[in-house]
Interface confidence: medium
């Protein structure tokens, strides 16, 4: 899966734009597309054959400071009878996300981009069977 | 599209630091935690009972400019025999991510935060059965 590239070159030089001099850019922190009224069916996490719960991680020096991380409920998957089937595995799907890290420096807070690997939900997979020699 | 949520203005650091009224901050775009040797198992997308493919979306005015979005391969789920079971549904797990949007489009070093809803993978769920009256 294609993860966001380091970006400095991408941000510094779009097309024929001259490169940035100090690796910093100005960012307007008013968020566009905030929420958009999108309602994501909550019950996926419970109706899934690989159900999961959310843990909220909090970090006051990170933006966003609250991030919901998924945790698979079982090691196996839930079959049609509602029983755990250990011949299949519940695994977390991971996604790289960008966050901002605050580094206090007197009155002028400085911020930098940081990558985080986030578990976003679970899926049911066939285990890899290693054949004995 | 939802306009700036800046409205919920921000709190400032202890001391006598004046708050900013222009809603912009300087961000160092050299990424922390870049690559950390994290490897996201690619084969989940094929071994899952709700397999998916990735489409790469490209936008030169966005950072990251390339983002991989998942698309479920089937409407049903794949059973132990490798057949599609239409009594279950493959659904995309969605995740909010932060991106930087270049404004105005061009060589400007000004960006704004934008939230995007991204399909990151698929999971197999029991459909909701609506009882007839």
């Amino acid at each position: 899966r294609k993860n966001p590239k380091a970006g400095v070159p991408a941000l510094q030089k779009a097309g024929n734009c001259p490169p940035l001099e100090d690796n910093t850019v100005r960012v307007d922190i008013r968020i566009f597309n905030q929420n958009q009224g999108i309602s994501v069916p909550r019950e996926f996490q419970n109706r899934s054959s690989s159900p999961w719960d959310y843990n909220i991680t909090r970090d006051p020096h990170r933006f966003p400071s609250e991030i919901a991380e998924a945790q698979c409920r079982h090691s196996g998957c839930i079959n049609a009878q509602g029983q755990e089937d250990s011949t299949m595995n519940s695994v977390a799907i991971q996604q790289e996300i960008l966050v901002l890290r605050r580094e206090p420096q007197g009155c002028s807070n400085s911020f930098r981009l940081e990558k985080m690997l986030l578990k976003v939900g679970c899926t049911c997979v066939k285990p890899i069977v290693h054949q004995a020699a | 599209r939802k306009n700036p949520k800046a409205g919920v203005p921000a709190l400032q650091k202890a001391g006598n630091c004046p708050p900013l009224e222009d809603n912009t901050v300087r961000v160092d775009i050299r990424i922390f935690n870049q690559n950390q040797g994290i490897s996201v198992p690619r084969e989940f997308q094929n071994r899952s009972s709700s397999p998916w493919d990735y489409n790469i979306t490209r936008d030169p005015h966005r950072f990251p400019s390339e983002i991989a979005e998942a698309q479920c391969r089937h409407s049903g789920c794949i059973n132990a025999q490798g057949q599609e079971d239409s009594t279950m549904n493959s659904v995309a797990i969605q995740q909010e991510i932060l991106v930087l949007r270049r404004e105005p489009q061009g060589c400007s070093n000004s960006f704004r935060l934008e939230k995007m809803l991204l399909k990151v993978g698929c999971t197999c769920v029991k459909p909701i059965v609506h009882q007839a009256a």
């Epitope: 922190i29 968020i31 905030q34 929420n35 958009q36 009224g37 999108i38 309602s39 994501v40 909550r42 959310y54 909220i56 909090r58 006051p60 020096h61 933006f63 966003p64 400071s65 609250e66 991030i67 919901a68 991380e69 998924a70 996300i97 966050v99 605050r102 807070n109 911020f111 986030l118 976003v120 | 599209r1 939802k2 306009n3 700036p4 949520k5 800046a6 409205g7 919920v8 203005p9 921000a10 709190l11 400032q12 650091k13 630091c17 708050p19 900013l20 009224e21 222009d22 809603n23 912009t24 901050v25 969605q94 995740q95 909010e96 991510i97 932060l98 939230k115 809803l117």
Partner: antibody
Framework: QVQLVQSGAEVKKPGSSVKVSCKAS????????FSWVRQAPGQGLEWMGG????????NYAQKFQGRVTITADESTNTAYMELSSLRSEDTAVYYC????????????????????WGQGTTVTVSS | EIVLTQSPDFQSVTPKEKVTITCRAS??????LHWYQQKPDQSPKLLIK???QSFSGVPSRFSGSGSGTDFTLTINSLEAEDAAAYYC?????????FGQGTKVEIK
């Protein structure tokens, strides 16, 4: 569970200033954004402005621009709203309210809106 | 600024009746509209966020709908404890604004 506790009632003379505080207990100030909303007697709610602690940025409604100053002190987990050049029509209950929306990410399920409000501070402006 | 106009200003309703309050925005605000309930001498409480999403702990008789410029708050089967003022609020663009409020009284 976060609670917002505001300072007590104030009686002020026209032309003076008032500074209302809003202390967040049970949570970190910088993890949220805050708005100040006022309500004159028998009237509706009016948004005055707000502050995003993490970034140290503020926004004010045009009506109050130049008279209102919103600040916060992360060391004491307290937000402040100061209103100057008071007049009789500033007599109102002043509320601080927390907005968690801005700070959440991860799952699109975690939306809150102005979910926690202070108890309100009555400011009376009278000569 | 975006002006929110609620109607009616006042409604006197008998218990178990259905109450409908509308909120019209002077320009499109997508789904960025929220509803609050305020009882006498109390702080406002969030009921519905983003037009239709119920806030946790809010009774299921409260529901919201709409997008763009026209929004509705519905109270199905009104209870005595629902006597309050109801306000719509937009967070689509600055400055944030509220509707003038609708007072619901129990007959």
């Amino acid at each position: 569970q976060v609670q917002l506790v505001q300072s007590g009632a104030e009686v002020k003379k026209p032309g003076s200033s008032v500074k209302v505080s809003c202390k967040a207990s049970g949570g970190t100030l910088s993890s949220y954004a805050f708005s100040w909303v006022r309500q004159a007697p028998g009237q509706g709610l009016e948004w005055m402005g707000g502050i995003i602690p993490f970034f140290g940025t503020v926004n004010y409604a045009q009506k109050f621009q130049g008279r209102v100053t919103i600040t916060a002190d992360e060391s004491t987990n307290t937000a402040y709203m100061e209103l100057s050049s008071l007049r009789s029509e500033d007599t109102a209950v002043y509320y601080c309210a927390r907005d968690r929306d801005y700070y959440g990410l991860g799952s699109p399920l975690h939306y809150y809106g102005l979910d926690v409000w202070g108890q309100g501070t009555t400011v009376t402006v009278s000569s | 600024e975006i002006v929110l106009t609620q109607s009616p200003d006042f409604q006197s309703v008998t218990p178990k009746e259905k109450v409908t309050i509308t909120c019209r925005a002077s320009q499109s605000i997508g789904s960025s509209l929220h509803w609050y309930q305020q009882k006498p001498d109390q702080s406002p409480k969030l009921l519905i966020k983003y037009a239709s999403q119920s806030f946790s702990g809010v009774p299921s008789r409260f529901s919201g709908s709409g997008s763009g410029t026209d929004f509705t708050l519905t109270i199905n089967s009104l209870e005595a404890e629902d006597a309050a003022a109801y306000y719509c609020h937009q967070s689509s663009s600055l400055p944030w604004t509220f509707g003038q409020g609708t007072k619901v009284e129990i007959k």
